[in-house]
């Protein structure tokens, strides 16, 4: 392990399609990758008229824009499906929406899922 | 082991599209991102643009915005360039590539664009 | 985001070593450790050598190494082979927020 840095092992798991897909709908997931390369966290999710949706959650492969990410954080302005990734076990069991490019302060708090 | 698995040689008409696949297999196909890039008879590479499998997500490179519609269906784990508007400049071999890093390529699709 | 520069051919003899450069500009190669280098042989898909500057892709010899100086990243061949001789390319990490971008090439003739 890189002294300072979080290494991901495993994600919290979620899949709302899971009956379509064949998966499970909820657990964690042991991350797998190449061994040189870090591994991380993600989520995805909708805002649909207020309402969080979550859409997938789970183990991301090694992606610069990831890095040393403690919390899992959407930056993008009012994306279709968000998305955020984030460095550590289980960080992305939270995650929340922060606006770039907002100058006024952002409307969505932090965001804990509860799966159905 | 990884793999990407494109579809054949196209031969299209001036004006028309044309739409090139790429089946992944050997990984979790939702966990990064698929780049395309293109390359003409004797020439470089050239980056096209990337979707984030799992959100879907895009971003083209500027040259291409507009003709290039890239997506991906996460059921059958394969991501599709579709180009558009074909003329005979589009002539190339064109690759899928796994994650920011490209670290797993296609085999490439030659598309011949000609009347 | 323009093209990253390369010197279009490089070469040497079985046993020495190669240098291929690739420059870009403080914003992209000078602030960032998201290069990659890629080798196609002709006919053939490239293959990922170099990731984040420096990081050898598993299975790539320890003869091919990478580094950086301010705007200009570097792929460095030692012991020279013969299999060696290829197009090199160097890129960047696509994804995100970030745009994809790649060198001209640089053809390596092992003499």
């Known amino acids: 392990a890189i002294l300072g840095r979080s290494e991901t092992q495993e994600c919290l798991f979620f899949n709302a399609n899971w009956e379509k897909d064949r998966t499970n709908q909820t657990g964690v997931e042991p991350c797998y990758g190449d061994k040189d390369k870090r591994r991380h966290c993600f989520a995805t999710w909708k805002n649909i008229s207020g309402s969080i949706e979550i859409v997938k959650q789970g183990c991301w492969l090694d992606d610069i824009n990831c890095y040393d990410r403690t919390d899992c954080v959407e930056k993008k302005d009012s994306p279709e499906v968000y998305f955020c990734c984030c460095e550590g076990n289980m960080c992305n069991e939270k995650f929340s929406y922060f606006p770039e490019m907002e100058v006024t302060q952002p409307t969505s708090n932090p965001v804990t899922p509860k799966p159905p | 082991q990884v793999q990407l698995v494109q579809s054949g040689a196209e031969v299209k008409k001036p004006g028309s599209s044309v739409k090139v696949s790429c089946k992944a297999s050997g990984y979790k196909f939702t966990s990064s991102y698929i780049n395309w890039v293109r390359q003409a008879p004797g020439q470089g590479l050239e980056w096209m643009g990337t979707i984030n499998a799992v959100s879907g997500s895009t971003s083209y490179a500027q040259k291409f915005q507009g003709r290039v519609t890239i997506t991906a269906d996460t059921s059958t784990s394969t991501a599709y360039m579709e180009l558009s508007s074909l003329r005979s400049e589009d002539t190339a071999v064109y690759y899928c590539?796994?994650?920011?890093?490209?670290?797993?390529w296609g085999q490439g699709t030659l598309v011949t664009v000609s009347s | 985001q323009s093209a990253l520069t390369q010197p279009r051919s490089v070469s040497g003899s079985p046993g020495q070593s190669v240098t291929i450069s690739c420059t870009g500009t403080?914003?992209?190669?000078?602030?960032?450790?998201?290069v990659n280098w890629y080798q196609q042989h002709p006919g053939k898909a490239p293959k990922h050598m170099i990731y984040g500057v420096s990081k050898r892709e598993s299975g790539v010899p320890d003869r091919f190494s990478g580094s950086k100086s301010g705007n200009t990243a570097s792929l460095t061949i030692s012991g020279l082979q013969a299999e060696d001789e290829a197009d090199y390319y160097c890129g960047t990490f696509a994804g995100g927020k970030y745009y994809g971008v790649f060198g001209g090439g640089t053809k390596l003739t092992v003499l």
């Open positions: 590539a796994r994650g920011g890093w490209f670290d797993y």
């Open positions: 403080s914003s992209d190669v000078g602030s960032k450790n998201y």
